[in-house]
């Protein structure tokens, strides 16, 4: 029979039959090792590869590029899944970016991008976005314009400042930007007037800290 | 390149008007909010005026409200300082200033204009 | 307003050897976000003022090295660790904390 092929992402793994939300290991295009991710399967469709996660603190974002390049944490937890898979995913296939939050009251909403892809190391893993809708806001809270990642050891962003020391946190800063999905967590009656929290502008505001955030991809085609 | 060019000062008899205006590039103006500041001769800063980046926000210096219109058109890439009423104290070269960072995040001026003279005599 | 007390107001200093500038404000400027709303500014002769320090510690993009800020609360220091002839002008704090933003009354560097 036929040999059955290594699933690329978390689309795959669904259109194998595997529907339900978990951890699973996917084979990215050019990358010499397997990656364990997180899919969801249960969001509009499921079948999303999640890149990022936050949702109680437990891990520190405050690190430098290597490790932004490489990714830490635990996919059954918080993580960051690496902008070197990343930029491999999404040089597989046309993606679509989701990004899913929650408030302290609450209160969740989504942002989605019909495009989605970042470029390689040396072009600063850049952000490429098109098509913005989604509840978390009418404008967009991630750069559509392109903007290149920055962490504490590697000022890329567009400001006489350093966004990523002074707001913590990898990210796509411009200057530093309408959101930070990896700044620093806040607790419940902590999380406002927050400069360096976790902060998606266009739906709670410019120092208003969230409670859980996930970012995750799927195919334009699924 | 970041660049605030100003224009409009210049010499105006005590009660009579004057409008300032601060032109910007090289940056996403809608994005950011900005300052009038002023500095009389030979002496410092003094903060005049804010507009928010959608020019929602708005705020005046005690020794400017009710006479002073700060206003901004973001498809012109422009900030304006409407001055009314104006008395010998309000003579000071007058600069425009952009916050530091984007989205009405106050952390103090990033960018200045070149300045222009406004002398308020009789 | 919060008044802003700089000194000293002239500083005549040797090329080569360090300068400090004391910034104190009436009322504490750190805010419950754990940062201290206080920036520095150059003003060099004939010029517009220009960012060397924003909240309290951070050095602007392009600002020497040898330029830096510390403190909390109501005292602040701007240190210039050897001072160049480039670095001549008027040096002013400003609290952004509480509204309205007010200035320090200037510290003139001059050199000796």
């Known amino acids: 029979r036929e040999e059955e092929k290594p699933f690329r992402d978390c689309a795959d793994v669904y259109q194998a039959g595997f529907n339900k939300s978990g951890i699973y290991t996917i084979y990215i295009n050019n990358m010499p090792e397997p990656k364990k991710v997180f899919c969801n399967m249960d969001v509009n469709g499921g079948g999303w590869t999640v890149i990022q996660h936050r949702e109680d603190g437990s891990l520190d974002f405050q690190r430098g590029w290597k490790e932004y390049k490489m990714g830490f944490g635990n996919p059954s937890g918080e993580y960051w899944l690496g902008n070197e898979f990343i930029f491999a995913i999404t040089s597989q296939r046309q993606y679509m970016l989701r990004i899913e939050l929650m408030d302290w009251e609450g209160n969740r909403a989504y942002s989605q991008y019909d495009r989605f892809h970042i470029g390689n190391e040396k072009q600063n893993y850049r952000l490429y976005l098109k098509g913005h809708t989604g509840t978390a806001g009418k404008q967009s809270s991630l750069i559509l314009h392109g903007a290149d990642f920055s962490t504490k050891d590697a000022d890329n962003d567009n400001c006489m400042c350093k966004c990523a020391l002074m707001l913590t946190g990898g990210w796509w800063f411009d200057a530093c930007g309408p959101s930070n999905l990896n700044g620093m967590f806040y607790t419940a009656g902590q999380n406002h007037g927050k400069l360096n929290g976790i902060k998606w502008h266009y739906f709670k505001g410019p120092s208003y800290s969230l409670r859980s955030t996930t970012m995750m991809i799927r195919p334009l085609d699924f | 390149e970041v660049q605030l060019v100003q224009s409009g000062g210049g010499v105006v008899q005590p009660g009579r008007s004057l409008r300032l205006s601060c032109a910007a590039s090289?940056?996403?103006?809608?994005?950011?909010?900005m300052h009038w500041v002023r500095q009389a001769p030979g002496k410092g800063l003094e903060w005049v005026s804010y507009?928010?980046?959608?020019?929602?926000?708005?705020y005046y210096a005690d020794s400017v409200k009710g006479r002073f219109t700060i206003s901004r058109d973001n498809a012109k890439n422009s900030l304006y300082l409407q001055m009314n009423s104006l008395r010998a104290e309000d003579t000071a070269v007058y600069y425009c200033?952009?916050?530091?960072?984007?989205?009405?995040?106050?952390?103090?001026?990033?960018?200045w204009g070149q300045g222009t003279l406004v002398t308020v005599s009789s | 307003d919060i008044v802003m007390t700089q000194s000293p107001l002239s500083l005549p200093v040797t090329p080569g050897e360090p300068a400090s500038i004391s910034c104190r404000s009436i009322?504490?400027?750190?805010?419950?976000?754990?940062?201290?709303?206080l920036d520095w500014y150059l003003q060099k002769p004939g010029q517009s003022p220009q960012l060397l320090i924003y909240?309290?510690?951070n050095r602007a993009s392009g600002v020497p090295d040898r330029f830096s800020g510390s403190g909390s609360g109501t005292d602040f220091t701007l240190k210039i660790s050897r001072v160049e002839a480039e670095d001549v002008g008027v040096y002013y704090c400003?609290?952004?904390?509480?509204?309205?933003?007010?200035f320090g009354q200037g510290t003139k560097l001059e050199i000796k």
């Open positions: 909240l309290g510690s």
């Open positions: 090289g940056f996403t103006f809608s994005s950011y909010g």
């Open positions: 009322q504490s400027l750190l805010q419950s976000n754990g940062y201290n709303y």
């Open positions: 400003m609290q952004g904390t509480h509204w309205p933003p007010t």
């Open positions: 200033a952009r916050d530091l960072l984007d989205y009405d995040i106050w952390t103090g001026y990033g960018y």
């Open positions: 507009i928010s980046s959608s020019g929602s926000t708005i």
